[in-house]
Interface confidence: low
């Protein structure tokens, strides 16, 4: 019988001077057998909660509590979620400045409103800190003799162009 730690299974530890595979104590784990010590399980507390509990062979995994999201590998930090209309800065959640918006809950940055005129369109609905502007249909250019009437159709926001 090979008297070494090489045959130890995960979930155990083994000391070279006394090469016997021993179970990891509670709240410790060993994903590789034959190591001289088991590792202390990660504790998910405070802003963290358990995503996966610790076992003898794998560490606990944490996730952030409601209102926070993970940062870094293995969710090493929790960052506060911002509301729509805000973005996270070093000073915390800040309201989007005029002309910008963020429609995401928790993450994202404030982005500039769409410039409707670049597409030759009019602004149908003004933007807010939470919503982008809504662009209307393209502005059609006609000869001076053409009369244009905009007739509402299908309730608010529904428009058709008729050339009379």
């Amino acid at each position: 019988v090979q008297n070494s730690c090489d045959n130890c299974q995960p979930g155990t530890f083994c000391r070279k001077y006394n090469p016997v595979c021993k179970s990891c104590p509670p709240s410790t784990f060993s994903s590789i057998g034959g190591q001289p010590n088991c590792n202390i399980c990660r504790v998910c507390a405070g802003y963290f909660r358990f995503k996966k509990f610790c076992s003898s062979t794998h560490n606990a995994e944490c996730e952030c509590i409601e209102g926070f999201h993970c940062l870094g590998p293995q969710c090493t930090r929790c960052e506060k979620d911002c509301r729509p209309g805000q973005e996270l800065t070093k000073q915390g959640c800040k309201t989007c400045s005029l002309g910008t918006f963020n429609d995401q809950n928790g993450t994202g940055v404030c982005r500039p409103w769409t410039n409707c005129s670049l597409d030759g369109r009019s602004v149908l609905k003004t933007g807010t800190t939470e919503k982008d502007v809504v662009c209307g249909p393209p502005v059609v250019s006609f000869s001076p003799s053409t009369t244009i009437s905009v007739t509402p159709e299908g309730g608010p926001g529904g428009h058709s162009l008729q050339v009379l």
Partner: antibody, heavy 126, light 106 residues
Framework: QVQLQQSGAELVKPGSSVKISCKAS????????LHWIKQQPGNGLEWIGW????????YYNQKFNGKATLTADKSSTTAYMQLSSLTSEDSAVYFC???????????????????WGPGTMVTVSS | DTVLTQSPALAVSLGQRVTISCRAS??????MHWYQQKSGQQPKFLIY???NLESGVPSRFSGSGSGTDFTLTIDPVEADDIANYYC?????????FGSGTKLEIK
């Protein structure tokens, strides 16, 4: 109030296997470990092992390696223990037990059993 | 494995104070817990981590100790307390129980 319901008494022949069940109600089944404990007539208690129903992870008291197999079914919130190659030494009451504690603590533990099933009597006899 | 030693039986008069001891073969820090088991029933959890009373357990029960020596005290003893009492350690795997102490009435 957490309740653990166990299957009824079993009379089995030596060499055979038996599978007993433990159904959990009013219990965060996937977030708490479930333990199995043996009590021979007139004797003390022996911890067999645990199962984490969340991922099926198990840990056995070395004494029961190969004797007991622990499984769990998340959909029915039921844990099972199969005992194989039965002998008269396996005649006992088997309890399932749980605890309202997180699985990872430092310092160790507390790893106590604060609620228990009523037990299942297994009698091995020819 | 950590062996837990309990005296097999104790006789006590109702209304008196009784202490049930549990000695561990090596230090278990404060990770000792106590259970009560009445005949034909499942164990009932009483005390965790040496001295913390489980909610709903009468205050006449108390626990103390650390390292290797632990005690469960019942003061005063009532007729309803006649049962077996087990200690359990969770400092290392496998978890182990004491052999139990039977509380009897004088």
């Amino acid at each position: 109030q957490v309740q653990l319901q166990q299957s009824g008494a079993e009379l089995v022949k030596p060499g055979s296997s038996v599978k007993i069940s433990c159904k959990a109600s009013d219990y965060t089944f996937t977030s708490n470990f479930l333990h199995w404990i043996k009590q021979q007539p007139g004797n003390g208690l022996e911890w067999i092992g645990w199962i984490n129903p969340g991922d099926g992870d198990t840990y056995y008291n070395q004494k029961f390696n190969g004797k007991a197999t622990l499984t769990a079914d998340k959909s029915s919130t039921t844990a099972y223990m199969q005992l194989s190659s039965l002998t008269s030494e396996d005649s006992a009451v088997y309890f399932c037990a749980g605890g309202n504690y997180y699985a990872a603590h430092y310092p160790p533990g507390p790893w106590y059993f604060d609620f228990w099933g009523p037990g299942t009597m297994v009698t091995v006899s020819s | 494995d950590t062996v837990l030693t309990q005296s097999p039986a104790l006789a006590v008069s109702l209304g008196q104070r009784v202490t049930i001891s549990c000695r561990a073969s090596k230090s278990v820090s404060i990770y000792m817990h106590w259970y009560q088991q009445k005949s034909g029933q499942q164990p009932k959890f009483l005390i965790y981590t040496a001295s913390n009373l489980e909610s709903g357990v009468p205050s006449r029960f108390s626990g103390s100790g650390s390292g290797t020596d632990f005690t469960l005290t019942i003061d005063p003893v009532e007729a309803d307390d006649i049962a077996n009492y087990y200690c359990q350690q969770s400092n290392e795997l496998p978890f182990t129980f004491g052999s139990g102490t039977k509380l009897e009435i004088k």
